[in-house]
């Protein structure tokens, strides 16, 4: 083993903050992978690891791509997977993960399942069904075209399965209330029996949620099949089509036939022999747990090992079981001693987010985003444009029961979708989608509902109300809202789209392109009013001057948020003004700023954080 210039932490109770997430894995899986990675080192050295929720943490964990705020840009897919800094203050001790990688558990993309009999467990790839091996979801054994997978290695033995994300179970966004596609459907007089991009210029696949789009105008977007989206070949980004014909033979899953290198591929049309369209199937990805355990070794002070079997050896290889080699253990114990852990429980499971003791000051550059880089736009022929970028979760209500050898055909009961109202009590909401002062009342939006809070004695909280009843054009999930204090027009943002309400009249959705914001701006975090019909528009750590009348940003005005508002979280997800103060929300917390709202005047003495508090307790005045 080697240590890093003798650097180590001077305390044994190490704290960490997961600053942002990759979209490759569900958040709880990412949380768990990091907790397990720390636990590896806690098993063999007298170290404890506690998750905290702010940049005062010893180890700040960040996903980023390319240039991501330090002097060491990432290099795209493969190559450099992550990097970490030796122990110390500031960026020292931090661990950064390249989000151009496919992060997995080391065994392929993680696909959540729906219904079936596995309680949402992810697909297990590869899995065996009727003696054949599958590395992606399949429709084999079904007559309704709904893709499914086994959630264990052997369906034949265990019978455990679930349905994969599919337009036959649900759609996303649009105005079809999440209902599944209806096939065939009519669009512009033509019949479609699969999702289509027709009528759209952005490549988003959509379908009608009734049999006739022309008549009913109800639609949704088809879920992405991550397990079957190809890379490389001549069809990158397209979906595998199963079954497909190759050299006269039918294939229902990815194959390495016809290749000397063993790489799995598929056709992206039903017949490779005639169309020659193909791509590589998603690879196994990199185990976030293993890479994190290696990086955390660095963050604790270990340099690379020359022992090929050691976790700290500089080359990635997937392995199962406890990852530390004697060399790794010798190294960490050299730094921190052999003593037993003070607490034998898993180290990283603090569930409550403590109030930050001081406003964060760290402002790395913009992290990767969960949204598509180019937002959907209305197609020339009138195909609908999408709603928000995060999908509604309710799906079919009836879970099918498994058959003896193959998963069952989905019954018609699966098509119904209930919109469930949230708990009446907004104090139970962890993170609101958007908060805005509208007509003198603070509005709290969440999942298609909102509450109104009037800060008067004896005037209780009102709601929940259905957002779509008050503002019918809006999608269920919002990123931010803003009322122009002069005209009283209300601006709503969701994904790459904006709606502007004047009373009950709506203009929109309008693409952010029309505002002068490029495709890298995937959502708007909020607006703060300036005088003379101007506002500041925020997105992912950057701020533009915005003309409320022309609804255009000044592209030359863009600066980093910390240049104008020091001490606020760089990745605030919601920003609004209330009672002449600016609020920057991150997670459960807000950072309040005394805001100088004169146009073209920035008083850096004034734009300072003057309070940090809880959204629920301090703004909503929850008990």
């Amino acid at each position: 083993f080697q240590t890093f210039k003798g650097l180590k932490w001077d305390h044994h109770n190490i704290t960490y903050w997961i600053q942002n997430y990759s979209e490759d894995l569900p958040r709880d899986m990412i949380d768990d992978a990091f907790a397990r990675a720390f636990a590896v080192w806690g098993e063999v050295a007298p170290l404890t690891f506690t998750r905290v929720y702010g940049p005062e943490a010893d180890i700040v964990i960040q996903f980023g791509v390319a240039e991501h705020g330090d002097g060491y840009p990432f290099d795209g897919k493969d190559g450099l997977l992550a990097h970490a800094f030796p122990p110390g203050a500031g960026v020292q001790g931090d661990a950064h993960f390249d989000d151009d990688e496919l992060w997995s558990l080391g065994k392929g993309v993680v696909i959540p399942t729906y219904y079936g009999n596995s309680n949402g467990a992810p697909c297990h790839f590869p899995f065996t069904f009727e003696g054949r091996s599958y590395s992606a979801c399949t429709t084999d054994g079904r007559n309704d075209g709904t893709p499914w997978c086994s959630t264990t290695a052997d369906y034949d033995k265990d019978g455990k399965f679930g349905f994969c994300p599919s337009e036959r179970l649900y759609t996303e966004h649009g105005n079809g209330e999440g209902k599944p596609c209806v096939f065939p459907f009519i669009f512009e007089g033509r019949s479609y029996s699969a999702c289509t991009t027709k009528g759209r210029s952005d490549g988003y696949r959509w379908c009608a949620t009734t049999a006739n789009y022309d008549q009913d105008k109800l639609y949704g977007f088809c879920p992405t099949r991550v397990d079957a989206t190809v890379v490389g070949g001549n069809s990158a980004g397209e979906l595998c089509v199963f079954p497909f014909v190759f050299l006269g033979k039918q294939y229902s899953s990815c194959t390495s036939d016809g290749r000397r290198d063993g790489r799995l591929w598929c056709a992206t049309t039903s017949n490779f022999d005639t169309d020659k369209k193909w791509g590589f199937c998603p690879d196994q990805g990199y185990s976030l747990f293993l890479v994190a355990a290696h990086e955390f070794g660095h963050a604790l002070g270990l340099d690379h090992s020359s022992v090929p079997e050691a976790l700290m050896y500089p080359l990635y290889s997937y392995l199962e079981g406890f990852p530390l080699n004697k060399d790794d253990i010798d190294g960490i114990q050299y730094l921190y001693g052999r003593g037993s852990k003070p607490d034998p429980r898993p180290p990283a499971t603090t569930t409550t987010e403590p109030q930050p003791t001081a406003p964060p000051t760290m402002c790395p550059t913009i992290p990767p985003t969960a949204y598509p880089t180019v937002g959907p736009t209305v197609g020339p022929t009138g195909a609908p444009s999408p709603g928000p970028t995060s999908s509604p979760s309710p799906g079919p209500t009836g879970a099918p029961s498994p058959g003896p050898t193959a998963p069952p055909t989905a019954g018609s009961s699966e098509a119904s979708t209930e919109s469930l109202s949230p708990a009446d009590n907004p104090c139970n909401v962890d993170v609101f989608d958007a908060i805005a002062e509208i007509q003198g009342a603070l509005h709290f939006f969440k999942d298609g509902w909102y509450w109104k809070f009037l800060n008067h004695r004896g005037s209780p909280l009102q709601g929940p109300f259905l957002t779509a009843r008050t503002w019918p054009a809006l999608p269920a999930t919002l990123d931010s809202a803003f009322e122009d204090p002069q005209t009283k027009r209300v601006f709503f943002f969701s994904g790459r789209q904006m709606w502007v309400y004047t009373g009950k009249t709506v203009l929109g959705p309008r693409s952010l392109d029309k505002l002068g914001l490029g495709p890298e701006v995937t959502h708007v975090s909020g607006l703060l009013p300036r005088r003379l019909g101007k506002a500041l528009l925020f997105s992912k750590g950057r701020v533009w001057r915005f003309d409320l009348k022309s609804q255009k940003v000044d592209p030359q005005s863009v600066i980093r948020v910390d240049k104008e508002f020091s001490g606020v979280p760089w990745n605030s997800h919601d920003i609004f003004q209330y009672q002449d103060k600016a609020y920057f929300c991150h997670g459960k917390f807000f950072w309040r700023v005394s805001f100088q709202n004169e146009v073209n005047k920035v008083d850096h003495e004034v734009n300072q954080v003057d309070d940090v508090g809880y959204v629920t307790y301090d703004l909503l005045q929850c008990p």
Partner: antibody
Framework: EVQLLESGGGLVQPGGSLRLSCAAS???????DMWWVRQAPGKGLEWVS????????FYADSVKGRFTISRDNSKNTLYLQMNSLRAEDTAVYYC?????????????????WGQGTLVTVSS | EIVLTQSPATLSLSPGERATLSCRAS??????LAWYQQKPGQAPRLLIY???YRATGIPARFSGSGSGTDFTLTISSLEPEDFAVYYC?????????FGQGTRLEIK
């Protein structure tokens, strides 16, 4: 012993092209980030480009779109293809080896440099 | 990009004296700073990496200190061969940048 040896410099007219090479020996070339840094006559140092072991490249704004860095790990050689050369590209061009290695950030600095090769852009 | 400002531009000292060279960053770069020495007609040579660590083969009279925005290269007792141009270089943020240099000349 680590050695870096540049070649390929010379006199070229504005708009012309040159290809610089840097032959490396004495270390595992394929594992390190490799850099080109230049120094105009009587001036300070300016980074030009870097290439990672994976082949990923980055360029200074002043050369973006005109210069291309590449490496041949089998030949332990670093290259810089310079097109559309301008008078302000006149400089001694050094190749340099990064002290850092892999994913452990902090060994900051270029621990070995070539002797440099002079590129003169003039009509 | 981060601007590194070196001072003084020129420092005139005699052998045996102590030299103190300064490098200031326009924003915090933690300890991601290196110092180089360059003699006429030669390539730069790495002296100090990560603000305070001496590179291989560098005499003990060279030392580096500082963190954040203010950094210092100290030569405790100047030898004749130390008269050269000294550059600082940061990698606390992208892109990397160099200071404009301090010329250390014999008084």
């Amino acid at each position: 012993e680590v050695q870096l040896l540049e070649s390929g410099g010379g006199l070229v007219q504005p708009g012309g092209s040159l290809r610089l090479s840097c032959a490396a020996s004495g270390f595992t070339f394929s594992q390190y980030d490799m850099w080109w840094v230049r120094q105009a006559p009587g001036k300070g140092l300016e980074w030009v480009s870097v290439i990672y072991p994976s082949g990923t490249t980055f360029y200074a704004d002043s050369v973006k779109g005109r210069f291309t860095i590449s490496r041949d790990n089998s030949k332990n050689t670093l290259y810089l293809q310079m097109n559309s050369l301008r008078a302000e590209d006149t400089a001694v061009y050094y190749c340099a080896k990064d002290r850092a290695y892999g994913d452990y950030v902090g060994w900051n600095g270029f621990d070995y440099w070539g002797q440099g090769t002079l590129v003169t852009v003039s009509s | 990009e981060i601007v590194l400002t070196q001072s003084p531009a020129t420092l005139s000292l005699s052998p045996g004296e102590r030299a103190t060279l300064s490098c200031r960053a326009s924003q915090s770069i933690s300890s991601f700073l290196a110092w180089y020495q360059q003699k006429p007609g030669q390539a730069p040579r790495l002296l100090i990496y990560d603000a305070s660590y001496r590179a291989t083969g560098i005499p003990a009279r060279f030392s580096g200190s500082g963190s954040g925005t203010d950094f210092t290269l100290t030569i405790s007792s100047l030898e004749p061969e130390d008269f050269a141009v000294y550059y600082c270089q940061q990698r606390g943020n992208w892109p990397i940048t160099f200071g404009q240099g301090t010329r250390l000349e014999i008084k």
